[in-house]
């Protein structure tokens, strides 16, 4: 039987790292203790329809982040997105896909929202 | 246990400097950032910087670019802070507050905290 | 620098309410929140992180809710230990900021 994925390292980007003064990218390994669980995410922006990111790295144990093996945006048109994800390196490639709301169904189907990758 | 141990309270004059020291004990003091916030009496609290205790490296609020130093020494474990200048608007009681390495990066455990009065 | 917003600045409330207490970002800030709690003449303590996420230890009485700009701290039954001033704090990005500050008093 498979177990979950463990997180021990994750991309990692910081657009602000002149500021912060820390590394702008590379890879993040994830340390911690035995009971927590780590996982990987990444933050966006859309600028007019071009992708900027924001941050990427390990982020602490967080159950919004359990079990999740992409990292996917799921809120409509936030300001910042933002995904999670449990796995090594799985905040590599992040992607858009809002949740519908439910409402009453029409004669003209919605077309899901592009995704965005990395 | 984590612990954060502060030096004790401080009264200094107008335009003289403060440092404040903080020992940090039960974890690995290079695994984790410092941070510094302080409150001045009757206020909120107010972020003025972080070190990062593995590399040495800073950033600093804007208000206090110039006027505040953080170091650190891993031997000890200690981090410092130095605040050069002062006023009587810094007084205010000094934190400093354990921040994890990994986002969000929460403040989860705190100094007892260091008054530092000025005045003349 | 991003302005976080608390409100109520102060709230009076019994053993066993459900207080609320609402924190506003001036801009997006995704999850990057945090709320402590802090009593007269100590150090403020770590609630909650990312929004919603209980810090160890922490009794489940306390929750967190909100992502972006909005963000809400929940003592579902208050007990007398949770009399205090509650503060929210962002880390999205350099200064990190703190909201004003709820106290929580006894009615």
């Known amino acids: 039987i498979l177990g979950r994925s463990e997180t021990q390292e994750c991309l990692f980007f910081n657009a602000n790292w002149e500021k912060d003064r820390t590394n702008q990218t590379g890879v993040e390994p994830c340390y911690g203790d035995k009971d927590k669980r780590r996982h990987c995410f990444a933050t966006w922006k859309n600028i007019s329809g071009s992708i900027e990111i924001v941050k990427q790295g390990c982020w602490l144990d967080d159950i919004n982040c359990y079990d999740r093996t992409d990292c996917v945006e799921k809120k409509d048109s936030p300001e910042v997105y933002f995904c999670c994800c449990e796995g090594n390196m799985c905040n590599e490639k992040f992607s858009y896909f809002p949740e519908m709301e439910v409402t009453q169904p029409t004669s003209n189907p919605v077309t899901p929202k592009p995704p965005y990758y990395n | 246990q984590v612990q954060l141990v502060q030096s004790g309270a401080e009264v200094k004059k107008p335009g003289a400097s403060v440092k404040v020291s903080c020992k940090a004990s039960g974890y690995t003091f290079t695994s984790y950032n410092m941070a510094w916030v302080r409150q001045a009496p009757g206020q909120g609290l107010e972020w003025m910087g972080i070190?990062?205790?593995?590399?040495?490296?800073?950033s600093y609020a804007q208000k206090f670019q110039g006027r505040v130093t953080m170091t650190r020494d891993t031997s000890t474990s200690t981090v410092y802070m130095e605040l050069s200048s002062l006023r009587s608007e810094d007084t205010a009681v000094y934190y400093c507050?354990?921040?994890?390495?990994?986002?969000?990066?929460?403040?989860?455990?705190w100094g007892q905290g260091t008054t530092v009065t000025v005045s003349s | 620098d991003i302005q976080m917003t608390q409100s109520p600045s102060s709230v009076s409330a019994s053993v066993g309410d459900r207080v609320t207490i609402t924190c506003r970002a001036s801009?997006?800030?995704?999850?990057?929140l945090a709320w402590y709690q802090q009593k007269p003449g100590k150090a403020p303590k770590l609630l909650i992180y990312?929004?919603?996420s209980l810090q160890s230890g922490v009794p489940s009485r306390f929750s967190g809710s909100g992502s972006g700009t909005d963000f809400t701290l929940t003592i579902s039954s208050l007990q007398p230990e949770d009399f205090a001033t509650y503060y929210c704090?962002?880390?999205?990005?350099?200064?990190?900021?703190f909201g004003g500050g709820t106290k929580v008093e006894i009615k």
């Open positions: 990312a929004a919603s």
């Open positions: 801009q997006g800030i995704s999850r990057w």
């Open positions: 070190i990062r205790p593995s590399v040495g490296s800073t």
């Open positions: 507050a354990r921040v994890s390495m990994y986002a969000p990066e929460p403040m989860d455990v």
């Open positions: 704090q962002q880390a999205f990005s350099h200064p990190w900021t």
